[in-house]
């Protein structure tokens, strides 16, 4: 009896220009001869229903139909047929087949790839044409995949230490889309220094797909307007 | 930085058993196999078998088949040697190394080494 | 098993002097038009280090005074100009098959 699992769930997350491996491991009932089997990788694009081979293993040769893709000889003697492919891509997203060929015996799995790529964060204080005592914080999120995003602003203060979300005063833009299929967008924070506590601390969270925890970019409202350092203007606080 | 820190010296009778640890950092352990060998007092090496921590699959050399097994502990990252039914020839320094899979067979980083006396 | 044959099996070499290991397998390391040869040293009191794998690869870090060839079943480790530091025993290990095995070693002193 011969047997292939994939992925447990049926789905395998990986980060933009990371080595992914793709899990396929074979099941037999005797130890495997790697000389008198096969191994063939296909891949189905999220756009064409057309499936085309990306790798395939047969005795004493291998080609790879997609650069750099590999499975392991080494780790096919114990069972192990799981596809290498270094610094993937986000149009490399779709649904991988991995067939496997002891003859007579044909045994295949299938498992859906999701290329993701995590957001940087950064906060900066624009101050051009506001108001007396008014500042504009602006969070950019940028480079990330898929995108879905949500940002929310929170705020600290010594009376209130848990964090409060703000809904007022923020204006999230559009999400622009970047040459490299990644994505952008700005939320900005409008405040009213004045009838503002010092102290209290301000937070951009942006929560996506590709981040176990919530990003968050922090500043403190001190007692002097404007008093941002420069690093706080311009830096990652995440 | 990669490294592979081994469990300490271990002292034996003949009969029981030994199992040796590797701790491994500084890569994505399932990304490469980890190999056993061992050396015994002013000899060569010896390659004992290895294991993929991915699918716990293990090849073993059929010289210890029956006495050796290796596992691994991925929420940890350390993989295991343990040989048992110890004779006085197995007195060695057991290794492990970082065993290169996809691109060519290689042992590229080594841990320090477990020395193991097996003495009545 | 595959039966890798280094000879000599020890050297002595006056520093900045050249090299030369020779290991001979019992049949051939080549599969899919690469060698499955490897080369290691280890130095007094240390465990092994890689050197060279697939014949001719030289490792991340090593000196390129250390070069390997050959394919199918004659392999050899140069060192160019050999340093105090190099002394030690050289292993050739082929991972072609299993088991994985080692050469004897050749034990490289400085005269």
């Known amino acids: 009896d011969l047997k292939v699992e994939m992925m447990a769930g049926g789905t395998q997350i990986t980060p933009l220009n990371d080595n992914v491996t793709i899990f396929c491991n074979i099941f037999y009932s005797q130890p495997l001869n790697i000389t008198s089997m096969g191994i063939t990788w296909f891949w189905k694009s999220l756009t064409f229903d057309k499936e085309v081979k990306v790798f395939e293993f047969f005795g004493d040769h291998q080609e790879a139909f997609r650069p750099g893709a590999i499975v392991s000889p080494w780790r096919l003697k114990s069972g192990d047929a799981s596809l290498r492919l270094p610094g993937i891509q986000l149009e490399e997203a779709g649904e991988y087949r991995c067939e496997v060929v002891v003859t007579p015996l044909k045994a295949q799995g299938t498992v859906q790839l999701e290329v993701v790529a995590s957001p940087a964060s950064r906060l900066l204080l624009d101050q051009v044409g506001m108001k007396e005592n008014e500042d504009k914080y602006m969070c950019e999120s940028s480079g990330f995949y898929p995108e879905a995003i949500n940002i929310t602003w929170e705020k600290q203060t010594q009376k209130f230490p848990h964090p409060i979300e703000i809904s007022e005063d923020v204006i999230t833009g559009p999400t622009i889309k970047n040459m490299d299929g990644t994505f952008n967008v700005t939320s900005c924070l409008k405040l009213n220094s004045s009838q503002e506590d010092p102290g209290t601390v301000y937070q951009c969270v942006v929560r996506h797909a590709s981040l176990h925890t919530p990003l968050r970019s922090n500043f403190t409202l001190t007692a002097a307007r404007h008093s941002l350092s420069e690093t706080e203007k311009t830096d990652n606080f995440s | 930085e990669v490294q592979l820190v081994q469990s300490g010296a271990e002292v034996k009778k003949p009969g029981a058993s030994v199992k040796v640890s590797c701790k491994a950092s500084g890569y994505t352990f399932t990304d490469y196999n980890m190999d056993w060998v061992r050396q015994a007092p002013g000899q060569g090496l010896e390659w004992m078998g290895d294991?993929?921590?991915?699918?716990?699959?293990?090849l073993y050399n059929q010289k210890f088949r029956g006495r050796v097994t290796m596992t691994v502990d991925t929420s940890i990252s350390t993989a295991y040697m343990e040989l048992s039914r110890l004779r006085s020839d197995d007195t060695a320094v057991y290794y492990c190394a970082r065993s290169e899979v996809f691109y060519g067979n290689y042992a590229d980083y080594w841990g320090q080494g477990t020395t193991v006396t097996v003495s009545s | 098993d595959i039966v890798l044959t280094q000879t000599p099996l020890s050297l002595s070499v006056t520093p900045g002097q050249p090299a030369s290991i020779s290991c001979k397998a019992s049949q051939s390391v080549d599969y899919d038009g690469d060698s499955y040869m490897n080369w290691y040293l280890q130095k007094p009191g240390q465990p092994p280090q890689l050197l060279i794998y697939?014949?001719?690869t030289l490792h991340s870090g090593i000196p390129d005074r250390f070069s390997g060839s050959g394919s199918g079943t004659d392999f050899t480790l140069k060192i160019s100009r050999v340093e105090a530091e190099d002394v030690g025993v050289y292993y050739c290990q082929q991972s072609k098959e299993d088991p994985r095995t080692f050469g004897q070693g050749t034990k490289l002193e400085i005269k």
């Open positions: 697939a014949a001719s």
């Open positions: 294991i993929n921590p991915n699918n716990g699959g293990t």
